[in-house]
């Protein structure tokens, strides 16, 4: 764009150099050239000469009018055709921008990743504004009434050191640009309720060589949180549908989870946890792929057929992936829930 230009005259924009997308816009060019009575005044947008909707107002001034201007950015300049000059003479130039006032930020969420030392807040910014937009995060203690503000672009990390005076806060986000300002809804935050346990990792898996082979998945976390609730999802690499198994975990030792799976198949496993009774989940762990061993017996085994299943408090549900290319972004699509697991002694993950 045009940042520094020596003008021999003036250029101005109505309603202003930054305006709402879709507005009608008038751009004026006024020459102040020495030794030139211009025959014509020309307008250029992004280097291309404009042909239409140009009005000569008087000897020194012309205007170009745009109906419903909808380009996010353009650089305009105007020139004069001076008698006796081979080339047009530059008068002035301006960068112009169009955009939208911000939407109110939505889906404000704040979490503390265990050991991070930060409260991380994220939100949806809404539709693109096309112009520079700032986000101001307000954090107000409900106990001391002290308010802090943080400037952000799309998320903010606030050191928990600056949140020492209180456990309960009100958090909201202001979106600000030159066309307007909107506030998010206020979020009530209790620091003890938003901790996400330290990442859970699947370290290895093995399939036993029994008559009915079972796969044992070993997983761990460095969390210090005592009561943790976890989900492990698994599927064959060729399948779209995940099965999900739920666990109450105690990470003072490595967790072992048993599965009765199709033989000679490649499975992918992922795990995620939350503090029991809280609402914020870890992201799913990195996919862990395990190949089950070839079937040794001749029985055509059905994973969920009797007599291998008995009722339990654990849950296995069916979840369908939206896209096989996005293993981290899954959605519950079906409501098929199977409460049960294959019987084989004590499977309650007692390490």
């Amino acid at each position: 764009g045009i940042t520094s230009i020596n003008c021999s005259g003036d250029m101005w924009v109505e309603p202003g150099e930054i305006f709402q997308m879709g507005m009608n816009v008038s751009i004026y060019c006024q020459e102040a050239l020495k030794h030139c009575r211009p025959r014509n005044l020309y307008f250029y947008k992004n280097g291309f000469k404009e042909e239409f909707d140009i009005t000569r107002i008087n000897r020194t001034t012309a205007r170009i009018w745009y109906k419903g201007f909808s380009e996010p950015h353009a650089y305009m300049h105007c020139t004069a055709e001076c008698p006796g000059h081979f080339q047009e003479t530059l008068i002035c130039g301006k960068d112009i921008s169009s955009g939208h006032p911000p939407d109110a930020p939505s889906n404000l969420t704040c979490v503390i990743y265990e050991y991070s030392g930060n409260m991380t807040c994220t939100w949806n910014t809404g539709k693109p504004t096309y112009i520079d937009t700032k986000y101001i995060v307000h954090v107000k203690s409900l106990e001391t009434e002290e308010e802090q503000q943080y400037l952000a672009s799309s998320y903010v990390k606030i050191s928990t050191d600056s949140l020492q005076g209180s456990r309960k806060y009100l958090v909201w986000v202001q979106a600000v640009n030159s066309l307007g300002m909107e506030n998010s809804q206020q979020l009530h935050v209790h620091l003890d309720d938003i901790v996400i346990p330290s990442a859970s990792i699947i370290s290895r898996a093995e399939t036993t060589n029994d008559t009915v082979p079972k796969t044992i998945v070993y997983w761990k976390s460095k969390t210090m949180i005592e009561k943790v609730f976890c989900e492990m999802r698994y599927k064959t690499t060729t399948n779209q549908t995940w099965s999900v198994k739920e666990f109450d975990a105690n990470f003072t030792y490595v967790q072992q989870s048993e599965f009765y799976l199709e033989p000679d198949s490649k499975y992918v496993f992922q795990v995620r946890c939350q503090e029991t009774g809280k609402r914020n989940w870890q992201p799913w762990s990195s996919p862990f792929v395990h190949q089950t061993s070839q079937e040794t017996g001749k029985r055509n085994w059905q994973p969920w057929s009797s007599p291998f299943v008995h009722q339990t408090s654990q849950t296995v549900s069916q979840v369908t992936a939206k896209s096989s290319h996005e293993p981290q972004k899954m959605e519950m699509l079906s409501a098929t829930i199977f409460r049960g697991h294959p019987a084989s002694g004590n499977h309650q993950d007692i390490g």
């Epitope: 960068d95 112009i131 520079d132 700032k134 101001i136 943080y150 400037l151 952000a152 600000v176």
Partner: nanobody, 116 residues
Framework: QVQLQESGGGSVQAGGSLRLSCAAS????????MGWYRQAPGKERELVSM???????FYADSVKGRFTFSQEYAKNTVYLQMNSLKPEDTAMYYC??????????WGQGTQVTVSS
């Protein structure tokens, strides 16, 4: 750490004008997003005007067309020219320096009182 010092407040009749100044020291204020804020008694601090980027300034609806934000790089100073003042503009006015991800730093404030 940046230090901010406001000045220029005072008492004025409705319809009058004031020019507030905010001088920054101890920091390259060019890396700040500078703003003017105000707090009336018993109310929350509110954003009055903010320099969003070059050539782009936010003004609260209540001050649009009456207040003008400007800056003087050489003096590390920003200004708020307040014209056509109204009694509802009475408040403590603060300037703030915000940098991405950091806590906003405030000046001590300067009192503006508009009487009818």
């Amino acid at each position: 750490q940046v230090q901010l010092q406001e000045s220029g407040g005072g008492s004025v009749q409705a319809g009058g004008s004031l020019r507030l100044s905010c001088a920054a020291s101890g920091y390259t204020y060019s890396s700040c997003t500078m703003g003017w804020y105000r707090q009336a008694p018993g109310k929350e601090r509110e954003l009055v005007s903010m320099l969003i980027s070059d050539g782009s300034t936010f003004y609260a609806d209540s001050v649009k067309g009456r207040f003008t934000f400007s800056q003087e790089y050489a003096k590390n100073t920003v200004y708020l020219q307040m014209n056509s003042l109204k009694p509802e503009d009475t408040a403590m006015y603060y300037c703030g320096c915000a940098t991405l991800g950091s806590r906003t730093v405030w000046g001590q404030g300067t009192q503006v009182t508009v009487s009818s």
